[in-house]
């Protein structure tokens, strides 16, 4: 194929791939008609003047995972047709000025996972057609004003995983076509007002894993097309009342792992497309009425691992489409009987690891479609008569690790559980805590006659007498609430994320892998 170097493979489709540690320089001669060249996993340490001079038809050039630390300014001369250039995963600390001069067709430039210490306006001033610029995984501490001013056609800019401590409010001002901006895993402590004002077409903004403490009230007011906003794992302690008011297209918002203490009513201003809201691992202590009332399409609400001790009866007003509600690992002692009344479509509720000592009899009154209720590890001594009567779809109920009081008052619950054992699962059953003479015995098979009779002996029983036989398999494996493998955080849908960590830690929100995004 027009002279393929021995250390490379060349395909009919004008694709050349050169790999291996024995390669220490760009192989020659390269086929003059090559359109794609990949130089991967070699020991090349530098690119000298014009090594690609004779392959001017080249459209894509990948020089990745090498030992490359030095590039001569004229290395890419004569590549006027080049659209895609990747120098990712090398050891570049410095980019020579003028390196990309003459690359008039360049649309994608990948410089990620190097050791770049700085970029200058002159680096990209010739790249007027650039659409994608990947700079994540370098050592950048500062982006100078003007660095991106000539990249007016840029649609994707990734500056994640650097060491940026602050951002100039003018650095993105000319990027009116930008759709994706990623600044995750830096050291940003605040974002100046106006920083994103010029980004009128922005669809994704990734600011997670920084040290942002405060958000300016109007920070996102010009970003009406924003669909995905990642603010997780920062130090945000409060949300200005209007900060999310102008985001009608938002469908993904992550705020987990911050220091939020309270949420004011209406803070999540009209977001008709928001489907998931992740608020776990904050310091929220209470939920006021109507705090989520603008989120009419919300399906997943994760409030676990906070310090919530009080939920106002109208806190979940407006959440008529909610399917999953995670409130586990909080400090709830009581729940108002009407708190879930508006959640007509709720399927899964996680209330485990709280301090609930009793539940109102009408707590699940209007939530007829509930399939899974997690109540383990609370301080429940009994449950009101008939609390689960109407829940015909209930197929998973977790009641273990509560101090069940096995006196005669427990009989109605015991009888219902006896008839509905499949719903409890087989791994862990609820056991009696008191009286002491029956402590540790299964609540389901306990002989209540040996227990101390209670003062008030109710008529037996009010729980449904019909055994539960599901029409279909109780819960498909892919969505089992007791699934042991879960994502610890929502997958923040990145094409350039190399790994998604999966863990056996079931603590994040007590739901499922399939439900976790």
């Amino acid at each position: 194929y027009h002279g393929c170097p021995s250390e490379c493979t060349c395909s009919r489709a004008s694709q050349v791939e050169c790999t291996g540690a024995r390669i220490v320089a760009v192989p020659t001669p390269l086929p003059w008609n090559a359109m794609s060249l990949q130089i991967l996993n070699t020991h090349i340490t530098e690119l000298n003047e014009s090594p690609f001079l004779n392959i001017s038809a080249l459209i894509a050039l990948r020089i990745e995972k090498n030992e490359l630390s030095r590039i001569t300014p004229g290395a890419f001369r004569n590549l006027g047709s080049l659209r895609y250039l990747s120098l990712a995963n090398n050891k570049l600390q410095v980019l020579p000025i003028g390196l990309f001069q003459g690359l008039d067709s360049l649309e994608s430039l990948l410089l990620s996972s190097n050791q770049l210490l700085q970029i200058q306006p002159a680096h990209f001033s010739q790249c007027s057609n650039l659409k994608e610029l990947q700079l994540h995984g370098n050592h950048l501490e500062y982006i100078p004003d003007g660095a991106f001013d000539h990249l007016v056609g840029l649609t994707k800019l990734n500056l994640g995983k650097n060491s940026l401590t602050h951002i100039s409010p003018r650095v993105f001002q000319h990027l009116g076509n930008l759709q994706v901006l990623r600044l995750y895993e830096n050291r940003l402590t605040d974002i100046p007002m106006g920083t994103f004002d010029g980004l009128v077409n922005l669809q994704e903004l990734a600011l997670q894993q920084n040290q942002i403490g405060l958000l300016s009230p109007g920070l996102f007011h010009n970003n009406h097309n924003l669909q995905r906003l990642y603010l997780s794992n920062n130090h945000i302690s409060q949300l200005p009342p209007s900060v999310f008011m102008q985001l009608p297209q938002l469908n993904r918002l992550t705020l987990f792992g911050n220091s939020l203490k309270e949420l004011s009513p209406g803070i999540f201003g009209p977001m008709p497309n928001l489907r998931e809201l992740w608020l776990y691992d904050n310091h929220i202590s209470s939920l006021p009425d109507n705090v989520f009332s603008n989120l009419r399409q919300l399906q997943v609400l994760i409030l676990s691992r906070n310090q919530i001790s009080f939920i106002s009866p109208g806190a979940f007003n407006g959440l008529t489409e909610l399917r999953e509600l995670s409130l586990h690992t909080n400090a709830l002692q009581d729940l108002d009987g009407n708190v879930f009344r508006m959640l007509a479509n709720l399927q899964n509720i996680s209330l485990q690891n709280n301090r609930l000592r009793q539940l109102p009899g009408n707590i699940f009154a209007n939530v007829n479609g509930l399939m899974a209720i997690q109540l383990q590890n609370n301080q429940l001594e009994n449950l009101p008569l008939g609390i689960f009567d109407h829940l015909g779809k209930l197929c998973e109920l977790r009641l273990y690790d509560n101090p069940w009081r096995c006196d005669s008052d427990i009989l109605p619950l015991r009888n219902w559980l006896l008839l509905n054992q499949p719903r409890l699962g087989t791994d862990t059953v609820p056991v009696c805590f008191s009286p002491a003479n029956v402590r540790g015995q299964s609540l389901i098979i306990i002989n209540v006659n040996v227990a101390v009779p209670s003062v008030h002996v109710p008529e037996v029983p009010s729980y449904p007498e019909t055994p539960w036989y599901p029409d279909t398999p109780s819960y498909p494996d892919t969505t089992s609430v007791s699934s042991t493998t879960e994502l610890t955080s929502p997958v923040e849908d990145y094409t350039d994320l190399t790994t998604i960590q999966v863990t056996d830690d079931r603590s994040v929100w007590g739901m499922t892998q399939a439900q976790s995004g």
Epitope: A331, Y400, D401, P435, A436, G440
Partner: antibody, heavy 120, light 112 residues
Framework: EVQLVESGGGLVQPGGSLRLSCAVS????????VHWVRQATGKGLEWLGV???????NYNSALMSRLTISKENAKSSVYLQMNSLRAGDTAMYYC??????????????WGQGTTVTVSS | DIVMTQSPDSLAVSLGERATINCKSS????????????LAWYQQKPGQSPKLLIY???TRESGVPDRFSGSGSGTDFTLTISSLQAEDVAVYYC????????FGGGTKVEIK
């Protein structure tokens, strides 16, 4: 007879980790919860966490990131794993359970404790 | 977290006299629905493990002598030893379990 016996204490380097064991007899871990409490010399009691009969755990929020409590029911053993140790973790470590008390978080049976010293 | 503050730090009382220990919580320990105060008292004698004396603020654990009594509600609680005996020399701790447990700093009771 109900017994709880702690083991695994000793000298640990700062930054290191420890794994303490609590061997129980006279009751089943599938029926009773077990707490861990520590006490620095001459100081007060500090609750560390609990593992309940069904395996659920609760932790002292200040230590949560460094603590893991687990158990093996068949071996009648409960474990306390603590990472990133510092001098302030030097203490007597007790395990305890709620055998007869009507107080769910009450601890009416205690082990004798095992001493952990964090020092270089 | 709920902070438990005991007073006094130490107390010297003559044999047969009354000893009173106070415990104050940073928030109420009374659950309005169960009408219980989630407060317990422990005794720790020198060189020994702690012993549970009283729970739910005023309920004596079985086997605890009736000279020990607990009182109080909400945020203020008291342990009283009506007639101090020599074997009562110990450090006494209050503990809340309204939220995840926290102990008070302890009160050392000695004989005057």
């Amino acid at each position: 007879e109900v017994q709880l016996v702690e083991s695994g204490g000793g000298l640990v380097q700062p930054g290191g980790s420890l794994r303490l064991s609590c061997a129980v007899s006279g009751f089943s871990l599938t029926s009773y919860g077990v707490h861990w409490v520590r006490q620095a010399t001459g100081k007060g009691l500090e609750w560390l966490g609990v593992i309940w009969a069904g395996g659920s755990t609760n932790y002292n929020s200040a230590l949560m990131s460094r603590l893991t409590i687990s158990k093996e029911n068949a071996k009648s053993s409960v474990y306390l794993q603590m990472n990133s140790l510092r001098a302030g973790d030097t203490a007597m470590y007790y395990c305890a359970t709620h055998m007869i008390t009507e107080d769910y978080y009450g601890m009416d049976y205690w082990g004798q404790g095992t001493t952990v010293t964090v020092s270089s | 977290d709920i902070v438990m503050t005991q007073s006094p730090d130490s107390l010297a009382v003559s044999l047969g006299e009354r000893a009173t220990i106070n415990c104050k919580s940073s928030q109420s320990l009374l659950n309005s629905r169960t009408r219980k105060n989630y407060l317990a008292w422990y005794q720790q004698k020198p060189g020994q493990s702690p012993k549970l004396l009283i729970y739910h603020a005023s309920t004596r654990e079985s086997g605890v002598p009736d000279r020990f009594s607990g009182s109080g509600s909400g945020t203020d609680f008291t342990l009283t030893i009506s007639s101090l005996q020599a074997e009562d020399v110990a450090v006494y701790y209050c503990k809340q379990s309204y939220n995840l447990p926290t102990f008070g700093g302890g009160t050392k009771v000695e004989i005057k």
